[in-house]
């Protein structure tokens, strides 16, 4: 999904509103400096990209995080303020595959929404230049 | 495997009110987004408001006047409708997204809202 014609504002007000909150909660317990900021984004399409991937694909020690809050609501904020997001077909790889339904928080599901939130406030600051 | 079903459209006055039911099944509803979109005649489908773990979010064009909700026990979705105008003449869909897969919505077959005098 090309995600240049979302509504970025609209998204980041949801972000800050719930989306933050939720990421928090999540992280609840881990000192902000236990983790590494390694994944990057150069712009908000790119961000939303970064951050859609991070969420919803599952990883090596982390197949957990789809459904969490903070993802259910990233999905619904990107389905209102992105023209085309909820018609997005599935792909024969993505549908074959089996998802753990149970809900496991592992070190390196912490990790991986450290990332997230550094993601998430990098989209909120555009104008800054990558470092 | 998973049904939406729409009901509670029809023809409603400007500035009238109008309530539309969202039966889900084969799923639960806390597991899922839900939302509700629509299509006016020769437009795009765009998105009008999705709910997702308590928290809704809301199009600009009907923040104020539309208000969704979900009721787990009825497994219903709801989308309150008030101070409708002409623009909001639309096919109205109910959408749900299991949280797996990223972009992907089920749709339902749609209910038709006009507004008109």
């Known amino acids: 999904y090309d995600f240049t014609n979302c509504d970025f504002e609209k998204i980041k007000a949801a972000y800050l509103s719930t989306i933050s909150k939720d990421l928090i909660t999540y992280m609840s317990g881990t000192k902000s400096t236990e983790f590494n900021n390694t994944v990057s984004c150069s712009n908000r399409p790119h961000c939303l990209t970064e951050i859609q991937s991070l969420t919803f694909n599952p990883t090596a020690g982390c197949a957990s995080l789809a459904k969490e809050m903070f993802a259910m609501k990233t999905k619904a904020a990107l389905a209102i303020w992105c023209p085309g997001y909820s018609e997005t077909q599935i792909n024969a790889t993505q549908a074959m595959k089996k998802r753990r339904k149970r809900k496991v928080t592992t070190n390196k599901c912490l990790e991986q929404v450290s990332q997230l939130q550094g993601l998430w406030r990098r989209f909120n600051r555009p104008l800054l230049k990558q470092q | 495997e998973v049904q939406l079903v729409e009901s509670g459209g029809g023809l409603v006055q400007p500035g009238g009110s109008l309530r539309l039911s969202c039966a889900a099944s084969?799923?639960?509803?806390?597991?899922?987004?839900m939302g509700w979109f629509r299509q006016a005649p020769g437009k795009e489908r765009e998105g009008v408001a999705t709910?997702?773990?308590?928290?809704?979010y809301y199009a600009d064009s009907v923040k104020g006047r539309f208000t969704i909700s979900a009721d787990n026990s009825k497994n219903t979705a709801y989308l309150q409708m008030n101070s409708l105008k002409p623009e909001d003449t639309a096919v109205y869909y109910c959408a749900s997204s299991g949280s797996y897969y990223p972009g992907h919505f089920e749709w339902g077959q749609g209910t038709l809202v006009t507004v008109s005098s």
């Open positions: 709910i997702a773990g308590g928290g809704t």
């Open positions: 084969g799923f639960t509803l806390d597991d899922y987004v």
